[in-house]
């Protein structure tokens, strides 16, 4: 048994008396031999759950579920309620109201055992017939919606009479009807005005009724006509079985390039027109299970579902649906000499499904892995200028795929032929495997004698020790010039234009920062910045060569404060700056602040430097003149 | 030839106010390519760097966490020197203080050094 | 705030010795490091900045190695003039931090 709504809503007036019928209550049967008994809990209830008194007001019969006024709430008992409400005005009180059999013990008022029934208060005595609206002869306050499970018997859940008006108004005629297209499930008594359904309902059909109920009153000479929404849910079981759609029940897959752990190697959907279990219980009751093979395929793969809502058209409507994802995922990285073809099956169980027929379906993944062998071209040819600073990234080398690589580990080495001319460096980029050549002595780089540099790369995986190798030659370009005193040694520093430019910062491929204007589109990812290389810095990464040091690529890297307008880059840097963004790495801090613009209103009084003490820089304070005053401000 | 000389009171009560002045000679307070600051060192802190103060385009400070609640750095163009300001001291700020040289732009070293100047902090 | 950490906290040597003392930063900062020398009523003496690039004016017998975490400052001959505290530093982040000082005392 359960209830066609979990919560009911009826006035009460203070002297009401005794013998008002209030409403009735609706029980459906889930079997067609049940038949309910309705009790009501002993306690009334007001504002947060609080417990006001023992009900000694209103009574129920068990058997129709009709609940009335057994003696008059008179005002000094509205009184006593209220005085226990926690201090709120009392303006609902609420009953509980069981389906039999359950316990006696009065707990929790959980669906589809328990409903409750709200009741406004007004204090004051029932207002006179005359007076009231139609809406008020017709329907509650709270309009009702109604569930109803799927696949259970016929039953009434409604009654549309509201019984105190026609108890205490019974010279006013009001009639009901429901408005509904052909060939819908329910009826409306005329008699009785008793709603109920034709038959048993079918989730997977129609899941909601949008119905129309017309009440029309009739008092003396007039006719008034109220419609309102009257809509119904369907509630689903678990009585569909998994299928595939179009009938597709073998995924093939090939592992190369994407190895690593975690990675998905192939999918399969199955389909279930079902919506339960649901979401908390799905996964544990509607199971997947690798069928054993092989030890190596057990430890190297595992199937992981994923369940989703979605829509399906059913008779000119929508209803809800589950697609189910089994996704065949890599257990762990695969060595790159892994060579192997197999056939793995899962077998997935809707254990809530009853029949006919079987919950179950078997799933086919054809897999095959393949081995991946280490090329290099058989020659690199790159130039460096003799200006650049350390960190200057120059180029890249990069085995065959490298940029489809995923869970290969591939290490690059440099040896140098010359030993007193090994200027460059080698880092292996996390991203695409492949390997960041990298100044990294430049006392080197200005000797005449090194003026072309032959390296070879080597590129080796470690876990198999294969390995591959090519030849680099490097020509040194130009001629070194000491840079100006006093520029700083991260590019970032510089705010504006032409100190950048005049200046050289560590990353810097050609000895000079470059300056990168931005498009002053508010918080922008293209903020004005000073750089050592726009190609590399910033471009919203901390790569690994400006990993090894915060003065590279702040803009990137830091993670310090930023302040002024900006985005913060995840985990670090600066993903989005406002006007001109500099740094300054030693002291972790950026500044995104508008680009300067020069007033020519501003006199010689207003130049004059004025001390800002500004709590946001972290103790930081500043001299500046007026005129960035008013920018800063503005700001 | 740079030389910093510091001048200010060696003696200070709990809860007032350190002040210590560095007067720079062979160099400018306003140079672009270093930075002005104060150290401290006691027998059991050992040298502790305070904060700094340079200039480039506009003046920014610097200032240590342990005492960036109390602690101002001020350049004066006029005289050439900047000056610290510690509040609220107590016997825990006694150390001998020093103003240095920073080169701002190839890793911070202080190059050059004040005399020192003992401050004792008590009533 | 980085740590710097010295070995020793003092050691005995006699003049013309080869004396090495180590400072290990608490994280990685490059070659951000400093070396100073102090003697009692004096201020610190800048030896060698950048990790390893010798102050000018400083005798050649000093010399600075090392980059990441671990450093040293190694006197090939030690001279009278050379029983001192020595104290690193870092100025990789700010705080800029000194280590706790070596006392190198005559044997």
């Known amino acids: 048994l359960y209830f066609s709504r979990d919560a009911y809503w009826e006035k009460l007036y203070v002297d009401q008396p005794a013998g008002t019928p209030l409403l009735y209550v609706h029980a459906l049967r889930d079997a067609p031999e049940e038949v309910p008994s309705f009790r009501l809990g002993q306690h009334l209830y007001g504002t947060y759950r609080t417990r006001l008194h023992e009900n000694n007001w209103i009574c129920i019969q068990e058997d129709t579920g009709l609940l009335y006024l057994n003696r008059s709430l008179d005002r000094s008992s509205w009184e006593k309620l209220s005085g226990r409400n926690r201090g709120f005005p009392l303006l609902t009180v609420y009953l509980k109201v069981f389906l039999s059999p359950t316990s006696l013990r009065e707990g929790e008022c959980q669906w589809p055992g328990c409903a409750r029934v709200y009741f406004s208060f007004f204090n004051t005595s029932f207002p006179a017939c005359t007076s009231l609206k139609p809406r008020e002869l017709c329907f509650p306050e709270t309009r009702p919606s109604f569930r109803i499970r799927e696949n259970r018997p016929p039953g009434t859940f409604h009654q549309f009479r509201l019984l105190p008006v026609q108890f205490l108004c019974p010279n006013i005629s009001v009639a009901y009807r429901l408005l509904e297209g052909e060939g819908l499930p329910f009826r409306c008594a005329p008699d009785s005005l008793e709603v109920s359904t034709r038959w048993a309902l079918d989730r997977e059909q129609r899941e909601k009724y949008e119905l129309v109920a017309v009440c029309t009153v009739h008092a003396g000479a007039r006719e008034e006509v109220v419609m309102v929404p009257f809509p119904v849910t369907v509630y689903d079981e678990d009585d569909s079985a998994p299928t595939f759609p179009a009938g597709v029940d073998t995924a093939s897959a090939v592992v190369e390039f994407k190895r690593k752990e975690d990675t998905v190697v192939a999918t399969l959907r199955v389909f279930d027109a079902d919506v339960v279990p649901a979401s908390g219980e799905l996964v544990r009751r509607y199971t997947s299970t690798l069928l054993p093979g092989d030890t190596w395929t057990q430890q190297t793969f595992r199937v992981e579902h994923w369940p989703n809502e979605t829509s399906v058209q059913a008779n000119g409507s929508f209803v809800r649906a589950t697609v189910h994802d089994y996704r065949l995922v890599l257990n762990r990285n695969l060595s790159i000499s892994e060579n192997r073809t197999m056939q793995l099956a899962v077998l997935v169980n809707d254990s809530d499904f009853q029949g006919p027929g079987a919950g179950v379906l078997l799933l086919h993944f054809n897999v095959s892995v393949l081995p991946v062998s280490l090329h290099l071209p058989s020659s690199y040819s790159l130039s460096v200028s003799r200006r650049a600073r350390r960190f200057a990234q120059i180029g890249k080398v990069c085995v065959e795929n490298c940029q489809a690589f995923s869970g290969i580990n591939v290490q690059y080495e440099l040896h140098s032929s010359g030993a007193n001319c090994s200027t460059l460096g080698v880092v292996t980029s996390a991203e695409d495997t492949s390997g960041i050549l990298f100044v990294n002595d430049t006392k080197a780089l200005r000797r005449p004698k090194c003026a072309e540099l032959h390296y070879m790369v080597v590129a080796t995986n470690h876990q198999t020790s294969r390995q591959a190798q090519a030849q680099l030659l490097v020509t040194v370009e130009g001629l070194y010039v000491a840079e100006e005193a006093g520029c700083p040694l991260s590019c970032a520093v510089s705010k504006r234009r032409p100190e950048c430019e005049e200046c050289g910062g560590l990353g810097s491929p050609t000895g000079r920062c470059e300056w990168r204007q931005g498009d002053g589109k508010g918080i922008t990812r293209n903020f004005s910045t000073c750089s050592p290389s726009t190609k590399t810095c910033p471009d919203g990464h901390c790569d690994v060569v400006e990993t090894q040091d915060i003065n590279i690529c702040p803009q990137d890297c830091l993670r310090g404060s930023i302040v002024g307008g900006h985005e913060p880059g995840e985990p670090r840097g600066i993903k989005a700056g406002y006007g001109t963004c500099n740094c300054f790495p030693e002291e972790e801090k950026c500044f995104c602040e508008p680009e300067d613009i020069q007033d020519p209103l501003c006199d010689e009084l207003c130049r004059e430097q004025k001390l800002i003490s500004e709590e946001d820089l972290g103790g930081e304070q500043k001299l500046i003149s007026e005129e960035d005053l008013h920018h800063h401000h503005h700001h | 030839q740079v030389q910093l000389q510091q001048s200010g009171p060696g003696l200070v009560k709990p809860s007032q106010t350190l002040s210590l002045t560095c007067a720079i000679s062979g160099d400018s307070v306003s140079s672009n390519s270093v930075a002005w600051n104060w150290i401290r060192q006691s027998p059991s802190r050992g040298l502790e760097w305070l904060g700094r103060?340079?200039?480039?385009?506009?003046?920014?400070?610097t200032y240590a966490v342990s005492v960036k609640s109390r602690i101002t750095i001020d350049p004066d163009t006029s005289k050439n020197q900047f000056s610290l300001q510690l509040n609220s001291v107590t016997p825990e700020d006694t150390a001998l203080y020093y103003c240095?040289?920073?080169?701002?732009?190839?890793?911070?070293?202080?190059?050059?050094w004040g005399q020192g100047t003992l401050v004792t902090v008590s009533s | 705030d980085i740590q710097m950490t010295q070995s020793p906290s003092s050691l005995s040597a006699s003049v013309g010795d080869r004396v090495t003392i180590t400072c290990r930063a608490s994280?990685?900062?490059?070659?951000?490091f400093n070396w100073y020398q102090q003697k009692p009523g004096k201020a610190p003496k800048l030896l060698i900045y950048?990790?390893?690039s010798l102050q000018s004016g400083v005798p050649s017998r000093f010399s600075g190695g090392g980059s990441g975490t671990d450093f040293t400052l190694t006197i090939s001959s030690l001279q009278p003039e050379d029983f001192a505290t020595y104290y690193c530093?870092?100025?990789?982040?700010?705080?800029?931090?000194f280590g706790q000082g070596t006392k190198v005392e005559i044997k």
């Open positions: 103060t340079y200039y480039r385009s506009n003046w920014y400070n």
């Open positions: 950048a990790a390893s």
């Open positions: 530093q870092q100025t990789y982040t700010i705080p800029w931090t």
């Open positions: 994280q990685n900062i490059n070659s951000y």
């Open positions: 240095a040289r920073g080169h701002r732009y190839s890793g911070s070293y202080f190059d050059y």
